[in-house]
Amino acid sequence: AGVFELQIHSFGPGPGPGAPRSPCSARLPCRLFFRVCLKPGLSEEAAESPCALGAALSARGPVYTEQPGAPAPDLPLPDGLLQVPFRDAWPGTFSFIIETWREELGDQIGGPAWSLLARVAGRRRLAAGGPWARDIQRAGAWELRFSYRARCEPPAVGTACTRLCRPRSAPSRCGPGLRPCAPLEDECEAPLVCRAGCSPEHGFCEQPGECRCLEGWTGPLCTVPVSTSSCLSPRGPSSATTGCLVPGPGPCDGNPCANGGSCSETPRSFECTCPRGFYGLRCEVSGVTCADGPCFNGGLCVGGADPDSAYICHCPPGFQGSNCEKRVDRCSLQPCRNGGLCLDLGHALRCRCRAGFAGPRCEHDLDDCAGRACANGGTCVEGGGAHRCSCALGFGGRDCRERADPCAARPCAHGGRCYAHFSGLVCACAPGYMGARCEFPVHPDGASALPAAPPGLRPGDPQRYL
């Protein structure tokens, strides 16, 4: 057992051009806090995957208000260390995610709002008991400077916190064959209790006579790397003198997944699919509960009353993410029909409808054309309670009785050029716009925005489990 400690030194604009705007303002004072998430091994995992080694949240930093006109300085930080206790052996290799969160303290509806400002991640090797390691990570235009270390909690010592120390039985020296416990020179290393031959580098024990393996090692004495093992008899063209490598015990042999998890082999190792309420490399960690307050921004924690059941955050409209931490641009979901203009008022969405349409989402088509006629082949278009004629080429006016230039009204938006055509006018759009009247901006990735998912949801997964 031991503790991983993280000390944040600074969070502010990184070097180079494009300094970020301060996240706080006179109108919207805010303060920062940090979250660290640790996972064993060097695996590339999604940010949302569980923090199997543990997680911690810092205190809130001092309230900060930007000085008008001043560049964003390093922001005031919370006091103290972030500490993540670990119960078992320190794995030696680990992945981390450090998130910088902003708590907005303006007088917005609902009290403080939380938003994720920056997220950095990395994979490191670290021996327990070593000195502080310093690091700098960049997230966009922001830079985070921090130090970290892992230390063992007595009586554990060693680079994996697996050796145990006990107070000396005699005042002057340790028992036969036992060394003093550096740095606790007044204590002695406890007698070896692991299974005889258990690898000191890759194995550890918590009970006498057992040998538990660190990640990447297997076998009764943790001496076999996962997925390969020396073979004693030759295979095929290989000779007995040269030896060979054959697949060793399968990584799923003996099912390393605890708590009913199911094991599946991966190219480099194995993967446990954990039952509801458990996570971690081997499903050994029981879940965060609702009592831990995991839902931000007014989210309601559902389920997760105890560590054996996972929780879900039901997010208020306007927020999404497994912890309701992401603000949604609800207008990006294009909720307004029939060309209505979307307004996100914070407390609600509003659609400003084009003429001829009504309803909360402009879904109702007003019938203005009943009994109306348009001359010269014009067609009646419903609109705003009064009929309008869409006239054939060369005609205009309320009832299409006047001869007209179809381009006279400058119908092409955003600098598009208008051409008269036998079937009507044609717009040649300026770069970056599209549509019959060049009314739609083309998104930077070349695709127009499509409705993704309703507010508070992940696409295709309305009830996201952590």
Partner: antibody, heavy 118, light 108 residues
């Protein structure tokens, strides 16, 4: 100003299903979560269920096996069904709007008394 | 579920006096996700306070909320005749949403 109006029979026989509808005016039902709360005569408030237009629902575990909540966005209405009722289900039933800043209730209907009796 | 216990059950006071109503939770409520409501006979509840201490739109400033964790207070600084009613607290941290049993503020 948003208004909510409960409607449904005021008298239901034991073992039958209680059905109520809440009609929302002056706001789109798609903007909010919507909820049902009840209050037995002379007693306190009990949350029953809520729904979001996308289909997210949540139920009070004490009633979950008997409750169904649904939404009709085209009519701007949401509904409650409570099956196998007994006299203990006699209460004033309120529909309410859940705010966008948290799961509390900022607008309520005036309530409808449902009596379970043969 | 989080059980909310309100005390006292009944509070007998005169207009102009200060009322202090308590709401205690069976477990800590994260980020002070607690609301207060007022209910008069024959009427629906009226929302007063959210986030333990923020007043809802249109609520007079004689109503104030405080507290965090497990202990929350609703204070009415000077009782007006229209303030005599039943007051409920509600937590919105964890499902199921739960209400306290209510405190009746009656005229002495």
């Amino acid at each position: 100003q948003v208004q909510l109006q409960e409607s449904g029979p005021g008298l239901v026989k034991p073992s039958e299903t209680l059905s109520l509808t809440c009609t929302v005016s002056s706001d789109s039902i798609s903007n909010y979560y919507w909820s049902w709360i009840r209050q037995p005569p002379g007693k306190g408030l009990e949350w029953i269920s809520y729904i979001y237009y996308s289909g997210i629902t949540n139920y009070n575990p004490s009633l979950k096996s008997r409750v169904t909540i649904s939404v009709d966005t085209s009519k701007n209405q949401f509904s409650l069904k409570l099956s196998s009722v007994t006299a203990a289900d006699t209460a004033v039933y309120y529909c309410a709007r859940i705010t966008v800043t948290g799961f509390y209730f900022d607008y309520w209907g005036q309530g409808t008394l449902v009596t379970v009796s043969s | 579920e989080i059980v909310l216990t309100q005390s006292p059950g009944t509070l007998s006071l005169s207009p102009g006096e200060r009322a202090t109503l308590s709401c205690r939770a069976s477990q800590s409520i994260s980020r002070s996700y607690l609301a207060w409501y007022q209910q008069k006979p024959g009427q629906a509840p009226r929302h007063l306070i959210y986030g333990a201490s923020s007043r809802a739109t249109g609520i007079p400033d004689r109503f104030s909320g405080s507290g965090s964790g497990t202990d929350f207070i609703l204070t009415i600084s000077r009782l007006e005749p229209e303030d005599f009613a039943v007051y409920y607290c509600q937590q919105y941290d964890t499902s199921p949403l739960t209400f306290g049993g209510g405190t009746k503020v009656e005229i002495k």
